[in-house]
């Protein structure tokens, strides 16, 4: 922004600037260009000899300027376009200044003017173009300060050229009041802090519900001597609620939201909310619709499931395998997880109670995603009833749970229970056993073995009895073996499976149980 | 030193034509804007028409607009003025004159011209 | 068209004298005036240009002033050569257009 000090081009020639000596050289006239009357200060004595033709401008009052800007538009006669070359003519002219607190008025004098430089046109008017009125305008640009009296004056002195003035326009630069980022710079005196530090810091001011970002940097820019603003760091964001239109920020509308500061627009209500009021900084779940707390508040309020689909219960023997599939109501939400929870019953004295702690799960049973899972180790003559939950990220903010149950009754064995009587460097002798009340059921056993690390063949013997001698074994090895009842209503409860090995020829390895 | 020599007045009837001629010399001709102001007797001066160094732009009183018209030759030095459907007004001493903007010391260049030189003129008479 | 007007019409003067001229523009032309002397049977010679712009070689008894629409031509001791008629030209515009003259007699 260009603050205008002085325009002699837009007074229309009512400025009465001073000529010194008084009526010679220097001239106010008016010419036609463009059909438009133009004002111009000229002079032309090339003929005369030493010229020391002055023209000073009216006092100017400085206002908030250091640095003056002074912009001449003018014209110069080419010297070889009058007759003989006219031996005393010039095509250059001085500017000079002088700072004062008053206005001297008429009382000139030169000893208080500083030379500022000695202005040479780009392009001289030569004869055709004087002619055909083809005025080759020059525009020169000087730069005075640091001013710091309350006024000045500018003068031309004239030294033997034929010189027209047709503007001179003296101003200071300001970086004007700008938006930017969101934040408000205040208009600023474009000045030099020093001649290392040509740009002046201002700090801005977030405009109406704007605020700086938690932990970002205020805004700042850099006014430079040119009256230009740079390099901005830092911003504003429009706050919570608010959101940017142009320079400004707005309140989000009904039925929108925006829950930070940030650079986003406000964002729609998300489904299952209700209607938000202007400036809103969420939007509320609708009755029965809920937020976790790790939901973002952009995402659908949601509710938790219906309970799993299709539960079904199949005993294999002392195992169950539990399947279910997913709640027909989701809920809205992807994160449903599953736990499976047992209970037992006696069917003697009807009691019941929780069996956790007596039977064993393929995986663990809180928190399942898959929708399935194996139960074993149960006991045989006991109703078991399995209940499967499903849960989802907003379960927890409600009482009710959403489960089906399935039952199953076990008439299976008692896995046997297994140990090593004796052993070789190339046999096992292994024993077992099972509740009394239970081996009336058992028609055989049937052992199965093989090496440890080998999983492509095992060897199988059934008897009779509780014990059995592996033979043929190789030394020091080490081998899986499994017992399992054979019943009439088919295989039993499997031992768990224990690793023994044979004695090394040295006769040297420990027991393993 | 700058001579002009009008020549090609006479006496003419209304509606006939005339052509003048004026001879320079003295001077570079090219360079020089040339016009032609009459008077008519007993009467002041009044500007007829001018035409620029290199023959243009031209330009004419409103009281002979269409009628005349000026041109130049620079290579024979010579100005004319064709003067076609003569009246009585027009009847004058038509002076040949010539402006030089070397000699012109001002910075910017008037709207139009004065003239520094001038020939002796030569007498049109239209009358029956 | 810009009318000039000049005045007076004729005067009668001594040699020696002081004699002023006056030239009134209807409208502004700033310094674009010229005056002219014109003797009996010859043709006009150009005295001053721009105003006050004296033309090379004419005496320095003869001066010109004024602006905007009031100008002036003096002859500060008038000598027996200069007997005459003398017209105002202005060029502020194309129509270049001149005043009516004013004579100069010897009383």
């Known amino acids: 922004k260009e603050v205008v000090l002085l325009d002699f081009a837009a007074m229309k020639g009512e400025l009465g600037w001073l000529t010194h000596p008084y009526g010679k050289g220097w001239d106010l006239m008016q010419n036609i260009m463009d059909d438009m009357p133009i004002y111009m200060y000229s002079v032309c004595n090339v003929v005369s000899g030493d010229q020391d033709n002055w023209l000073r401008t009216n006092w100017v009052y400085r206002e908030e300027a250091e640095r003056i800007f002074i912009e001449l538009k003018f014209t110069v006669r080419d010297c070889n376009s009058f007759p003989g070359g006219a031996s005393s003519c010039k095509e250059t002219f001085n500017l000079y200044y002088a700072e004062s607190d008053v206005d001297y008025g008429t009382n000139f004098q030169k000893r208080q003017f500083t030379k500022i430089d000695t202005i040479a046109p780009d392009e001289i008017t030569v004869s055709s173009d004087f002619e055909a009125r083809n005025v080759k305008l020059n525009v020169e640009e000087r730069m005075v300060g640091p001013l710091t009296r309350k006024g000045f004056y500018l003068a031309f002195q004239d030294i033997g050229a034929c010189v027209a003035l047709l503007s001179v326009r003296v101003y200071y630069k300001k970086c004007p009041e700008m938006l930017q980022s969101l934040a408000r710079f205040p208009e600023t005196i474009a000045v030099a802090v020093s001649d290392t530090q040509p740009l002046a810091t201002v700090a801005g001011t977030c405009v109406d519900h704007a605020v700086v970002p938690y932990g970002g940097e205020g805004p700042l820019m850099h006014c430079t001597v040119d009256g230009e603003w740079l390099v901005p760091i830092g911003q504003c964001l429009c706050q919570e609620g608010y959101e940017k239109v142009e320079d400004a920020c707005r309140a989000c509308s009904p039925g929108f939201f925006k829950s930070e500061a940030s650079e986003s627009p406000c964002l729609e209500c998300p489904e299952h909310t209700l209607p938000s009021t202007e400036g809103a900084t969420s939007c509320q779940c609708e009755e029965g619709y809920f937020r976790a707390p790790e939901d973002p508040l952009s995402m659908s309020c949601t509710r938790p499931p219906s309970a799993p689909n299709y539960l079904t219960a199949i005993g294999m023997g002392a195992k169950v395998e539990l399947r279910w599939t997913a709640p027909k109501d989701t809920g809205g939400r992807q994160d449903i997880v599953y736990s499976v929870t047992c209970e037992q019953c006696w069917p003697e004295s009807g009691e019941c109670g929780p069996c956790e702690a007596s039977v064993r799960y393929s995986e663990p049973p809180h928190a399942l995603t898959r929708t399935s899972v194996t139960v074993s180790d149960l006991e045989p003559h006991m109703n078991y009833t399995f209940a499967v939950e499903a849960r989802n990220g907003v379960s927890g903010l409600v009482t009710s749970r959403s489960f089906r149950t399935a039952s199953v009754s076990i008439n299976q064995t008692e896995p046997p229970k297994v140990r090593l009587e004796d052993r070789s460097t190339t046999s096992l002798s292994v024993t077992w056993s099972i509740p009394v009340s239970q081996q009336s059921r058992v028609w055989k056993y049937e052992v199965t073995y093989r090496k440890k690390g080998d999983a492509n063949s095992y060897n199988v013997r059934r008897t009779e009895g509780f014990s059995v001698t592996l033979d043929d074994l190789a030394p020091d090895t080490t081998y899986l073996v499994q017992v399992q009842a054979l019943t009439q209503e088919g295989q039993g409860a499997g031992s768990k499976v224990h690793e023994f090995q044979t004695l090394s020829t040295e006769g040297s390895a420990n027991m393993a149980v | 030193e700058v001579q002009l020599l009008e020549s090609g007045g006479g006496l003419v009837q209304p509606g006939g034509s005339l052509r003048l001629s004026c001879a320079a010399s003295?001077?570079?001709?090219?360079?020089?804007?040339m016009a032609w102001v009459r008077q008519a007797p007993g009467k002041g001066l009044e500007w007829v028409s001018r035409i620029g160094p290199s023959g243009g732009p031209t330009h004419y009183a409103d009281s002979v607009k269409g009628r005349f018209t000026i041109s130049r030759d620079n290579s024979k030095n010579t100005l004319y003025l064709q003067m076609n459907s003569l009246r009585a007004e027009d009847t004058a001493v038509y002076y040949c004159a010539g402006y030089d903007s070397g000699y012109d010391y001002v910075a910017v260049a008037g709207p139009a011209e004065y003239f520094q030189h001038w020939g002796q003129g030569t007498l049109v008479t239209v009358s029956s | 068209d810009i009318q000039m007007t000049q005045s007076p019409s004729s005067l009668s003067a001594s040699v020696g004298d002081r004699v002023t001229i006056t030239c009134r523009a209807s409208?502004?032309?700033?310094?674009?005036l010229a005056w002219y002397q014109q003797k009996p049977g010859k043709a006009p010679k150009l005295l001053i240009y721009k105003a006050s712009n004296l033309h090379t070689g004419v005496p320095s008894r003869f001066s010109g002033s004024g602006s905007g629409t009031e100008f002036s031509l003096t002859i500060s001791g008038l000598q027996p050569d200069d007997f005459a008629t003398y017209y105002c030209?202005?060029?502020?515009?194309?129509?270049?257009?001149f005043g009516q003259g004013t004579k100069v007699e010897i009383k």
């Open positions: 409208q502004s032309i700033s310094t674009w």
């Open positions: 003295g001077f570079t001709f090219s360079h020089y804007m």
């Open positions: 030209q202005q060029y502020n515009s194309y129509s270049r257009t």
